[in-house]
Interface confidence: low
């Protein structure tokens, strides 16, 4: 007889979710020398226990502390990039630009790109069947926690210059409730970044407003400002051309107007 | 590492104003905000309100605001906090201070309002 | 704004022993909190900055530690010197709050 299980308003767990994390750990600490010392069965062990048998509306960040501590990395200064409502891209610009690292570049933010998953009180099972939504269900469910947990220790060890990709073509360029806005902005270290450059990244391409100047853009600065953070930000105009020309930084039509620079 | 430092103390009247300097040695002055902090006699220290020369941004506590101004000169890097309305309770020890690594404070300059 | 509550208000200590003063945040400062050392008639010194790296020149019994809300000063074994006020500040936003303060006094 089928237990009953409860209904959550969110898809369930990613089909093959331990198989897929196990494979992309031990993918990653291949390609990534500094990472070899990592043993992939501890990080899914401790991965598993954050959430197996727990009450997937009850997680907490010190569920993960176990996985955080094996998948601790660091990103040189002036190289961690952030973004918000536009991971493809800022995907696309770290894999070109290799000495600049997303979440999802590092260990933990890798294992879980993309995937679902949650269990349920008192069972070793995982649940394939719906995981808790965010809004509709509860804010402390597993992978809202889990991306909460790591985007925090992304941002408290960024040092230098940070940047960050904003989305330009949506109604709130910088948006406080988003991960960045709630907690990466918040957790940026005054003693150790200098400065958060915003990268604006415009959406027509007859689009030349200055999109630095947008409202939501001047609270991100007056935030940033207020944590003893200097701020700029840069309009990228044509998305497609700045990828090419950090592909190809010779191209003669490289050299100006690739981007509008604001100094603030 | 940036040294503060600041104008030398100051008597003044009730309701009179008193400005206070605090000069910036090191480091980029428009780049890291700049706060003023007070410490009245055998009191705890509270924060008046601060500075991002970079951007004339500024902040300033609930309880000082309307009388307190804060200035800065990105061309001497230096940093000024003007009170008003000056009152025997204003009587204190001000500091200038700022994270930079650390947290800098300037030597402090002792304001003393008495008729 | 965030409360700084510090704990306790007098410590009484004798020479050589340890001492343990405790800092509460009323909302995370993550790890931008410093401690202060007072004596009379002095400007505050500052002790420790990000929770827990010490200033330059402070001696290693002075040592910090926690990050969110809730943090701790030690000084392993107390000097006739040590015998201060001490303040916890946070900076992780303007304004900046600091605590009460922290009477270290000899037993």
């Known amino acids: 007889v089928p237990r009953w299980r409860q209904q959550w308003s969110g898809s369930g767990t990613t089909s093959r979710f331990p198989e897929t994390v196990l494979a992309r750990c031990v993918k990653y600490t291949e390609v990534h020398p500094e990472m070899r010392h990592v043993d992939c069965q501890s990080v899914w062990d401790a991965f598993k226990g954050a959430f197996i048998s727990k009450y997937p509306c009850n997680i907490t960040e010190e569920d993960y502390q176990p996985l955080v501590k094996l998948g601790t990395q660091t990103v040189p200064c002036n190289k961690t990039l952030l973004w918000s409502r536009i991971k493809d891209l800022a995907h696309q610009f770290t894999q070109v630009q290799r000495d600049m690292f997303t979440l999802e570049d590092m260990l933990l933010g890798y294992l879980a790109d993309d995937l679902t998953w949650c269990g349920e009180f008192n069972t070793f099972e995982i649940n394939y069947q719906s995981c808790p939504d965010w809004r509709k269900d509860c804010s402390n469910n597993p992978v809202s926690v889990f991306w909460k947990t790591v985007s925090r220790r992304f941002a408290e060890t960024a040092c230098g210059v940070v940047h960050v990709m904003l989305n330009g073509s949506r109604s709130k360029i910088f948006d406080k409730n988003s991960t960045f806005g709630s907690v990466e902005v918040h957790n940026l270290q005054p003693e150790k970044v200098q400065a958060l450059e915003a990268w604006v990244i415009h959406g027509g391409r007859e689009d030349s407003r200055d999109l630095c100047q947008d409202p939501t853009i001047k609270e991100l600065e007056s935030i940033i400002s207020k944590r003893n953070i200097r701020f700029f930000c840069k309009n990228i105009y044509r998305p497609d051309k700045f990828l090419q020309c950090v592909k190809n930084p010779e191209d003669s039509s490289c050299l100006s107007g690739i981007h509008h620079h604001h100094h603030h | 590492q940036v040294q503060l430092v600041q104008s030398g103390a100051e008597v003044k009247k009730p309701g009179s104003s008193v400005k206070v300097s605090c000069k910036a040695s090191?480091?980029?002055?428009?780049?890291?905000?700049i706060s003023w902090v007070r410490q009245a006699p055998g009191q705890g220290l509270e924060w008046m309100g601060g500075?991002?020369?970079?951007?004339?941004?500024?902040e300033y506590a609930q309880k000082f605001q309307g009388r307190v101004t804060i200035t800065a000169d990105e061309s001497t890097s230096t940093a000024y906090m003007e009170l008003s309305s000056l009152r025997s309770e204003d009587t204190a020890v001000y500091y200038c201070?700022?994270?930079?690594?650390?947290?800098?404070w300037g030597q402090g300059t002792l304001v003393t309002v008495s008729s | 704004e965030i409360v700084m509550t510090q704990s306790p208000a007098t410590l009484s200590v004798s020479p050589g022993e340890r001492a343990t003063l405790s800092c509460r945040a009323s909302q995370s400062v993550s790890s931008n909190l410093a401690w202060y050392q007072q004596k009379p008639g002095q400007a505050p010194r500052l002790l420790i900055y990000?929770?827990?790296t010490r200033a330059t020149g402070i001696p290693a019994r002075f040592s910090g530690s926690g990050s969110g809300t809730e943090f701790t000063l030690t000084i392993s074994s107390l000097q006739s010197e040590d015998f201060a006020v001490y303040y916890c500040?946070?900076?992780?936003?303007?304004?900046?709050?600091f605590g009460q303060g922290t009477k270290v006094e000899i037993k």
């Open positions: 990000g929770a827990s």
């Open positions: 500075i991002i020369a970079g951007y004339g941004a500024t």
């Open positions: 201070a700022r994270v930079y690594g650390g947290i800098d």
């Open positions: 500040q946070q900076y992780n936003n303007w304004p900046w709050t």
């Open positions: 090191g480091g980029v002055f428009s780049q890291f905000p």
